[in-house]
Amino acid sequence: AVSEHQLLHDKGKSIQDLRRRFFLHHLIAEIHTA
């Protein structure tokens, strides 16, 4: 079974990549970053 800790770790892996994709979209669409 996958532990809760592992699930949280896996979720955390992509946070910067999500920020990265959001910021790239922000530069194009000028959506607010907050």
Epitope: I15, Q16, R19, R20, F23, L24, L27, I28, E30, T33
Partner: antibody, heavy 118, light 115 residues
Framework: QVQLVESGGGVVQPGRSLRLSCAAS????????MSWVRQAPGKGLEWVAT????????YYPDSVKGRFTISRDNSKNTLYLQMNSLRAEDTAVYYC???????????WGQGTLVTVSS | QLVLTQSSSASFSLGASAKLTCTLS???????IEWYQQQPLKPPKYVMD???????STGDGIPDRFSGSSSGAERYLTISSLQSEDEADYIC?????????????FGGGTKLTVL
């Protein structure tokens, strides 16, 4: 094809100002964020400034914040970098770069050399 | 502090495979990075972005001889069947947004020599 052509470089004395331009063609300029990246002679790359598609948002590293200003004129398909209070350490080739939806610096110009010297 | 570390130089034989390494600061080991190629006296060229899981997207005109992979804080650029035109500096970069501020840093670059 995407084309970015920088101009405005030259020799300038410390403390003086200079404005660089980047003429863009081959794509819808007003649809993309743009950046300036510099490279001191024989050294590595350094990000200098980024501006959003419409010019509403600008970003700078601490090394140039308050001295450099990035701007754009979408009607002229041109990106600018106003550089004030220039220092010897600002001597570099300055490149403009265009983002895509996937990455920050997908396309680069050929660069323009700025030399700050007395 | 967001830092990228690269070896300053590497040499490989013509036709061989080259594996170049970019190491993220330990607290940023999950970050997506970018690879750039800079041939002598030319501007940088975007090669690929490379995620923590090893998935990557290559830039326009980049041959499929170029691939990426990841292990922990290390990000690898592998060039197979090395050709003379692959001789260049290979630079990694990484960006992040913190409190509505953008930061982008480059590694020092690895000078690849094809023997």
């Amino acid at each position: 094809q995407v084309q970015l052509v920088e101009s405005g470089g030259g020799v300038v004395q410390p403390g003086r100002s200079l404005r660089l331009s980047c003429a863009a063609s081959g794509f819808t300029f007003s649809s993309y964020g743009m950046s300036w990246v510099r490279q001191a002679p024989g050294k590595g790359l350094e990000w200098v400034a980024t501006i959003s598609s419409g010019g509403s948002y600008t970003y700078y590293p601490d090394s140039v914040k308050g001295r450099f200003t990035i701007s754009r004129d979408n009607s002229k398909n041109t990106l600018y970098l106003q550089m004030n209070s220039l220092r010897a350490e600002d001597t570099a080739v300055y490149y403009c770069a265009r983002q895509t939806t996937m990455t920050y610096f997908a396309y680069w110009g050929q660069g323009t050399l700025v030399t700050v010297s007395s | 502090q967001l830092v990228l570390t690269q070896s300053s130089s590497a040499s490989f034989s013509l036709g061989a495979s080259a594996k170049l390494t970019c190491t993220l600061s330990s607290q940023h080991s999950t970050y997506t990075i970018e690879w750039y190629q800079q041939q002598p006296l030319k501007p940088p060229k975007y090669v690929m972005d490379l995620k923590q899981d090893g998935s990557h997207s290559t830039g326009d005109g980049i041959p499929d001889r170029f691939s990426g992979s990841s292990s922990g804080a290390e990000r690898y650029l592998t060039i197979s069947s090395l050709q003379s035109e692959d001789e260049a500096d290979y630079i990694c970069g990484v960006g992040d947004t913190i409190k509505e501020q953008f930061v982008y840093v480059f590694g020092g670059g690895t000078k690849l020599t094809v023997l």
